[in-house]
């Protein structure tokens, strides 16, 4: 029960996380104009991974896509790539995890197969979350670097004159959405990996078999349930291990005095 809950919760958390990563990737507010020195401005600039926008005081907003590919900074391209890889891995992970869910029955899928799929999707979610966090962090680092460079330029202008025309950019809402979403996807992935441990059948799990005395004078012999040895001296008995063991119904029993007590 706890395994199913952990797996289900992991799936839901990852689903929310990946939805957040997609939302962050599509958002325009990755960097927003810093209004610290100029809170009353005619226009407000903000930029995303795919386009930059200008909003006027009237509320009118105009956005322009980055229609060039070669002219864009390498860091921006890297962030785009990280976010897309995160989305793709997350989407595949979601697809795999749907089939891995314990509460969903698909044919006669073994628990071991579900465990493997759960682990696979968990790893995919972890990598997806890390990609998103890395992408957002790279962009944030780029902003911080540019912010302090433009701050330095602002007060060391030509001939010591103060320049206040330079637009500085600070963290946009998309960065926070991306960090939270990446974290959720990561947590969901870890939960899936934990659930996998509970789903996987233990190697040392022996199936219970009930034995009947096969003759009038034969009594149960004490002995360890060893994987490779027969039970007592009866060589016809199968190995009591893994798939070789028989259940109570399958084991052939002969009528004896012990059966009619």
């Amino acid at each position: 029960m706890a395994v199913t809950a952990c797996q289900g919760l992991g799936f839901v958390v990852s689903l929310i996380g990946i939805a957040g990563i997609i939302a962050a990737t599509c958002m325009d507010q990755w960097s927003t104009q810093d209004l610290y020195n100029n809170p009353v401005t005619a226009v407000f600039n903000y930029q995303g991974l795919w386009r930059s926008c200008v909003r006027e005081s009237s509320g009118f907003t105009e956005c322009r896509g980055y229609f060039t590919l070669l002219g864009l900074p390498a860091m921006l391209q890297a962030v785009r790539a990280l976010m897309i890889v995160g989305i793709v891995l997350g989407a595949i992970g979601l697809l795999v995890s749907i089939f891995a869910l314990k509460c969903i029955r698909i044919g006669s899928m073994e628990d071991s197969a579900k465990a493997n799929m759960t682990l696979t999707s968990g790893i995919m979610f972890i990598v997806s979350g890390l990609c998103a966090i890395a992408g957002v962090s790279v962009f944030a680092n780029m902003l911080v670097t540019n912010f302090w460079m433009s701050t330095a330029n602002m007060y060391t202008g030509m001939g010591g004159m103060v320049q206040t025309v330079q637009t500085r950019y600070t963290f946009g809402a998309a960065l926070f959405v991306g960090w939270v979403a990446g974290g959720l996807t990561l947590i969901g992935g870890v939960m899936m990996c934990i659930a996998c441990r509970g789903l996987a059948p233990e190697e040392t799990n022996y199936k219970a078999v009930s034995y009947h005395a096969s003759g009038h004078s034969v009594a149960y012999k004490p002995g360890g349930f060893k994987a490779s040895t027969g039970f007592g001296s009866n060589t016809k008995n199968k190995k009591i291990y893994d798939g070789g063991a028989r259940t109570e119904d399958e084991v052939q029993s002969y009528p004896s005095k012990h059966d009619y007590v």
């Epitope: 005619a42 226009v43 200008v54 006027e56 009118f60 105009e62």
Partner: nanobody
Amino acid sequence: QVQLLESGGGLVQPGGSLRLSCAASRSTYCMGWFRQAPGKGLERVANVYMRNGDTWLADSVKGRFTISRDNSKNAVYLQMTRLRAEDTAVYYCAAGRSSCLEASISYWGQGTLVTVSS
């Protein structure tokens, strides 16, 4: 140089309707309307992107005004309904070559006066 020719202004009673027209001498990227009420600053009212027809309307006129375009005539129309006294202003047609932002507006019309009074 692009010439903008405005028409349709006049006196109208509150609750009445009016249609402003603006024709450009050649095609532009964006066309729209700004207004200036007596003793007030310039206010963006509406605009339309000529290529894809995307429109924008100020919150103060939403549900009352509509903007449309006719690419074959390089014209833009502002249909004003349920007019109020606060809509009284000089309405200016504006056009941009590459942007619709106020700072990037390349061409302005002479303006047409709209008076809403009973």
